[in-house]
């Protein structure tokens, strides 16, 4: 194959890959046809004056997870036709100017996980036709004016994982075509007015993982075409009354993990495109009538690991889509009875891990395709007559770690228990609570001294019991969860969450079995 | 250019397991779920479950809760679903694919993974 | 589990002509404004390929002759005009509980 060289393999269709540590300079000679060349977990540290000169056709090269601390300013001489080059993973601190000079054809710049410590102007000016500028995984703290300003036909530019404390409003500015940014993971605290006005056909940005505190109010009003919002993992404590307002094909935005401490009506939309959003891990206190009233199409909302203690009765006003609602680890202690009213379409609710102490007896009352209901690890004593009775599909119920008051009033929902005992599960029972001599006794079986009547146990509904966000493992049946820390660590701090006990959809989304797929 | 590229064939002993893996590229691999989906020859679909990178979350078709285990690593964005105490019923293509949101079609498949469980 | 019967098992219609099949489902899998039904393609060795989602959202990069209708229960995948790289087998799907597909329904031309 025009010689080979031996420490390299050569395919039929012009690919020359080079591997392995005893590689500690560019191989020779190349073969001249070559349009694809990989040198890759080499201990080459060093490219030298044009050691690719011969292979003036090679259109890809990847020089990657070597040793490469040092490269000559000419040592891309002569490729003119490259439309791809990677340097990731390697262990530049420096580049010199003028080593991309030449390259015209160039398309893609992968120079992510290094140790690049300042970029220049420069350093890209002769890369008009760069379409992708891979930065990531370095050690940029800034980047300055005009950096980019001759990639007009760049679409995809990534500067995440750096570390960055501030960009200036003007680095962006020539952009037009960008489609993707991403920031995160970065040392951001605030985002100048204007920086991202010119990027009118940006699609995803990505900013989640900083210490962004306030966000402009009109810093997404040029944006129109957004489609993917990345705002996790930050500080901010408020949301401008109009800063989601121009974003029309928005269909992911996530706000977890931020200091939110209220919303306010309207704040989303009109995004009729969203379907989830992540509310999760903030200080939100209450919710007021009408703040998701634009999210028509919204099917899951995750309001977990707040502080509600009010959710005004048209919070979920225009939630026509939602199916599923997590409310669990809040401080609620009272609902009012049309709070779910407009939620005709809801499966699942989670509301563990609050203070209810009592359900208004219409609470799910027009909600008749529940299929699952967290109520465990609350302050409620009894429940009103009837209140399930109409919930067809519930093949979820969930009533342990309840302070269930014992008494003759009880009767009614023990009765309603021992008829639907398959929709409790199997891993932790409701006990009673008081009075003291049957503290700790299950509510299903407790003797109250009055009279039962024998019943007969119908079948329930036979949707399988699929667990939802994550998997859980079974709670052993002597295990009460109602104190565990688990219960609100953060979802990030492990991965594989079905190994975990407790550690489970308890801990974000709350919902358990019957989940839609 | 999205792409979802599964492990090759196997052929497997009854009750020994199978790992099948599903290597992303051309998408944020974190930002959308991945379900699995068995088809049996000369059958139809079945979805046995999904995995949300984001968060590490799972979800299981009660059929295959106990046979079907989903992971991912996110560092390689590569999805895996391992099949264990494998019977001859479990002889099938296995595909990955691809959804937006939780509720949302399966917008890319894998080529398949054919596992054969014989004696 | 919501089962979804597709019909005819089989068709076989000339090439250019239209062909229709249908699938209806146990319970409703629709909202006011959404349908939680999808329709895939697939030859014979290939993955299933998404043409419809949501019941009559035409899938980027799907020919126009393909479109999904219906709601409720009853949904119909109409092929306007069928041509020759049509011939394959056509599952639909709902999310709207656990995912279920349809048993298929095996296209041929005449």
């Known amino acids: 194959y025009h010689g080979c060289p031996s420490e390299c393999t050569c395919s039929r269709a012009s690919q020359v890959e080079c591997t392995g540590a005893r590689i500690v300079a560019v191989p020779t000679p190349l073969p001249w046809n070559a349009m694809s060349l990989q040198i890759l977990n080499t201990h080459i540290t060093e490219l030298n004056e044009s050691p690719f000169l011969n292979i003036s056709a090679l259109i890809a090269l990847r020089i990657e997870k070597n040793e490469l601390s040092r490269i000559t300013p000419g040592a891309f001489r002569n490729l003119g036709s490259l439309r791809y080059l990677s340097l990731a993973n390697n262990k530049l601190q420096v580049l010199p100017i003028g080593l991309f000079q030449g390259l015209d054809s160039l398309e893609s710049l992968l120079l992510s996980s290094n140790q690049l410590l300042q970029i220049q102007p420069a350093h890209f000016s002769q890369c008009s036709n760069l379409k992708e500028l891979q930065l990531h995984g370095n050690h940029l703290e800034y980047i300055p004016d005009g950096a980019f300003d001759h990639l007009v036909g760049l679409t995809k530019l990534n500067l995440g994982k750096n570390s960055l404390t501030h960009i200036s409003p003007r680095v962006f500015q020539h952009l037009g075509n960008l489609q993707v940014l991403r920031l995160y993971e970065n040392r951001l605290t605030d985002i100048p007015m204007g920086t991202f006005d010119g990027l009118v056909n940006l699609q995803e940005l990505a900013l989640q993982q900083n210490q962004i505190g306030l966000l402009s109010p009109g810093l997404f009003h040029n944006n129109h075409n957004l489609q993917r919002l990345y705002l996790s993992n930050n500080h901010i404590s408020q949301l401008p009354p109009s800063v989601f307002m121009q974003l029309p094909q928005l269909n992911r935005l996530t706000l977890f993990g931020n200091s939110l401490k209220e919303l306010s009506p309207g704040i989303f939309g009109p995004m009729p495109n969203l379907r989830e959003l992540w509310l999760y891990d903030n200080h939100i206190s209450s919710l007021p009538d009408n703040v998701f009233s634009n999210l028509r199409q919204l099917q899951v909302l995750i309001l977990s690991r707040n502080q509600i203690s009010f959710i005004s009765p048209g919070a979920f006003n225009g939630l026509t889509e939602l199916r599923e609602l997590s409310l669990h680890t809040n401080a609620l202690q009272d609902l009012d009875g049309n709070v779910f009213r407009m939620l005709a379409n809801l499966q699942n609710i989670s509301l563990q891990n609050n203070r209810l102490r009592q359900l208004p007896g219409n609470i799910f009352a027009n909600v008749n395709g529940l299929m699952a209901i967290q109520l465990q690890n609350n302050q409620l004593e009894n429940l009103p007559l009837g209140i399930f009775d109409h919930l067809g599909k519930l093949c979820e119920l969930r009533l342990y770690d309840n302070p269930w008051r014992c008494d003759s009033d009880i009767l009614p929902l023990r009765n309603w228990l021992l008829l639907n005992q398959p929709r409790l599960g199997t891993d932790t029972v409701p006990v009673c609570f008081s009075p003291a001599n049957v503290r700790g006794q299950s509510l299903i079986i407790i003797n109250v001294n009055v009279a039962v009547p024998s019943v007969h146990v119908p079948e329930v509904p036979s949707y399988p019991e699929t667990p939802w966000y994550p998997d859980t493992p079974s709670y052993p049946d002597t295990t009460s969860v109602s104190s565990t820390t688990e219960l609100t660590s953060p979802v990030e701090d492990y991965t594989d969450l079905t190994t975990i006990q407790v550690t489970d959809d308890r801990s974000v989304w709350g919902m358990t079995q019957a989940q839609s797929g | 250019e999205v792409q979802l590229v599964q492990s090759g064939a196997e052929v497997k002993k009854p009750g020994s397991s199978v790992k099948v893996s599903c290597k992303a590229s051309g998408f944020t691999f974190t930002d959308y779920y991945i379900h699995w989906v068995k088809q049996a020859p000369g059958q139809g679909l079945e979805w046995i479950g999904l995995h949300y990178p984001y968060i590490g979350g799972t979800n299981y078709n009660q059929k295959f809760k106990g046979k079907a285990t989903l992971t991912v690593d996110t560092s390689t964005t590569t999805a895996y679903m391992e099949m264990s105490s494998l019977r001859s019923e479990d002889t099938a293509v296995y595909y990955c694919?691809?959804?937006?949101?939780?509720?949302?079609?399966?917008?890319?498949w894998g080529q398949g993974t054919t596992v054969t469980v014989s004696s | 589990d919501i089962v979804l019967t597709q019909s005819p098992d089989s068709l076989a219609v000339s090439l250019g002509e239209r062909a229709t099949i249908n699938c209806r489902a146990s319970q409703s899998v629709s909202t006011s404004s959404y349908s939680y039904m999808h329709w895939y393609q697939q030859k014979p060795g290939q993955p299933p390929k998404l043409l419809i989602k949501y019941a009559s959202s035409l899938e980027s990069g799907v020919p126009d002759r393909f479109s999904g209708s219906g709601s409720g229960t009853d949904f119909t995948l109409t092929i306007s005009s069928l041509q020759a790289e049509d011939v394959a087998v056509y599952y639909c799907?709902?999310?709207?509980?656990?995912?279920?597909f349809g048993g298929g329904t095996k296209v041929e031309i005449k």
């Open positions: 694919a691809r959804g937006d949101n939780k509720y949302d079609a399966m917008d890319y």
């Open positions: 799907e709902q999310s709207w509980e656990i995912r279920t």
